[in-house]
């Protein structure tokens, strides 16, 4: 018979046998044979391979380095890489989150419309009228300018995004 | 009954030939690899050689030893496999078992045994 | 060829002994190791195939094990009916080598 083109799932071509993939966790030290299956071996320590495979040499787990604001977020295992984050007050550069940067700060007349986290930096928005900010700040949101009404008061300065209203006492004459 | 009865054995001459037979019954015998085993008088187990199924096309493998003198063959529709000994020699006194090969990627062996047939090569 | 080779050649023992016979490989042989029993005059009979897997209809008193190149035939508590030569076989590279037999005598 023609020997096979084509192999099951979790399976590889070889020498014109089907032999079986090693198990997520494990590298391969030899094919199948006719009389034999294939040999895996565990991955060893802060090694690992996450998929059905035919890798001879298991991957090194990631190393989250703290020179440069990395952590662990998650420790791997011999079917998982692990996963970095970054440091209280910084954020992940990309996806792969390999190296930090400091959180962006909101400056005077924008809010924090979304705190950062380990993965996303500070996302800012203006204060729109009616709101101020007068700090530089990665977690201040845009205040709501004081009512002077509430305090039997008279707004005496205008606010700005910048800067509260000032309020004053009444004109009495105006009585 | 699942069995294999072989048969051919005798005296031969050096350089002579002899073909041994062995009858299966009792299973599908074209689905199995059949081998051929060896014990010369008094002494251990020696493989042969053995031939393939018919998933693998009855193809052969020998031992070092009698490649090139013996060959394995099989009629499956007498389920009978054969070896053809030619250029016999002394070394080749041996009972010479028949043996139905099986099992799994996870282990192959000799699961069924004939009872053996005496082959004396001598002058 | 991987040579296997098996200890002891011989060995005397009585009804309800504990035995062991050990098989050692030239090379890793990854647990394809089948035993056979063979007694005089008979044809060899398949006990223990990869290592630890016991044939149907062999008595449990049998077991093997073993990893590498080192592997152990074990007969828990020998019978009148276990007195016979015990062989070896690797079956993980052509051409299929035998153990040289150990025969286990009645004391």
């Known amino acids: 018979p023609e020997p096979p083109t084509a192999c099951r799932e979790k399976q590889y071509l070889i020498n014109s046998q089907c032999c079986s993939l090693c198990q997520p966790g494990q590298k391969l030290v030899s094919d199948c044979t006719e009389f034999t299956e294939t040999e895996c071996l565990p991955c060893g320590e802060s090694e690992f391979l996450d998929t059905w495979n035919r890798e001879t040499h298991c991957h090194q787990h990631k190393y989250c380095d703290p020179n440069l604001g990395l952590r662990v977020q998650q420790k791997g295992t011999s079917e998982t890489d692990t996963i970095c984050t970054c440091e209280e007050g910084w954020h992940c550069t990309s996806e792969a989150c390999e190296s930090c940067v400091l959180h962006r700060s909101c400056s005077p007349g924008f809010g924090v419309k979304q705190i950062a986290t380990g993965v996303s930096d500070t996302i800012c928005e203006p204060c729109p009228v009616g709101f101020f900010s007068n700090v530089s700040s990665a977690f201040e949101k845009c205040h709501p300018w004081t009512s002077c009404e509430t305090k039997d008061l008279v707004v005496q300065q205008a606010g700005t995004n910048k800067t509260d209203v000032v309020c004053g006492p009444q004109d009495r004459l105006r009585a | 009954e699942v069995q294999l009865v072989e048969s051919g054995g005798g005296l031969v001459q050096p350089g002579g030939s002899l073909r041994l037979s062995c009858a299966a019954s009792?299973?599908?015998?074209?689905?199995?690899?059949m081998s051929w085993v060896r014990q010369a008088p008094g002494k251990g187990l020696e493989w042969v050689g053995f031939?393939?199924?018919?998933?693998?096309?009855?193809?052969?493998e020998y031992a070092a030893s009698v490649k090139g003198r013996f060959t394995i063959s099989r009629d499956n529709s007498k389920s009978t496999l054969y070896l053809q000994m030619n250029s016999l020699r002394a070394e080749d006194t041996a009972v010479y078992y028949c043996a139905r090969y099986g099992g799994l990627k996870k282990g192959w062996y000799f699961d069924l045994w004939g009872q053996g047939t005496l082959v004396t090569v001598s002058s | 060829d991987i040579q296997m080779t098996q200890s002891p050649s011989s060995l005397s023992a009585s009804v309800g002994d504990r035995v062991t016979i050990t098989c050692r490989a030239s090379?890793?042989?990854?647990?394809?190791l089948n035993w056979y029993q063979q007694k005089p005059g008979k044809a060899p009979k398949l006990l223990i195939y990869?290592?630890?897997s016991l044939q149907s209809g062999v008595p449990s008193r049998f077991s093997g094990s073993g990893s590498g190149t080192d592997y152990t035939l074990t007969i828990s508590s020998l019978q009148p009916e276990d007195f016979a030569t015990y062989y070896c076989?690797?079956?993980?590279?052509?051409?299929?080598?035998f153990g040289g037999g150990t025969k286990v005598e009645i004391k």
């Open positions: 990869y290592t630890s």
């Open positions: 031939i393939r199924n018919k998933a693998n096309a009855y193809t052969t």
């Open positions: 009792g299973f599908t015998f074209s689905d199995y690899y």
């Open positions: 076989q690797q079956g993980i590279n052509l051409p299929w080598t």
């Open positions: 090379q890793g042989i990854r647990n394809y």
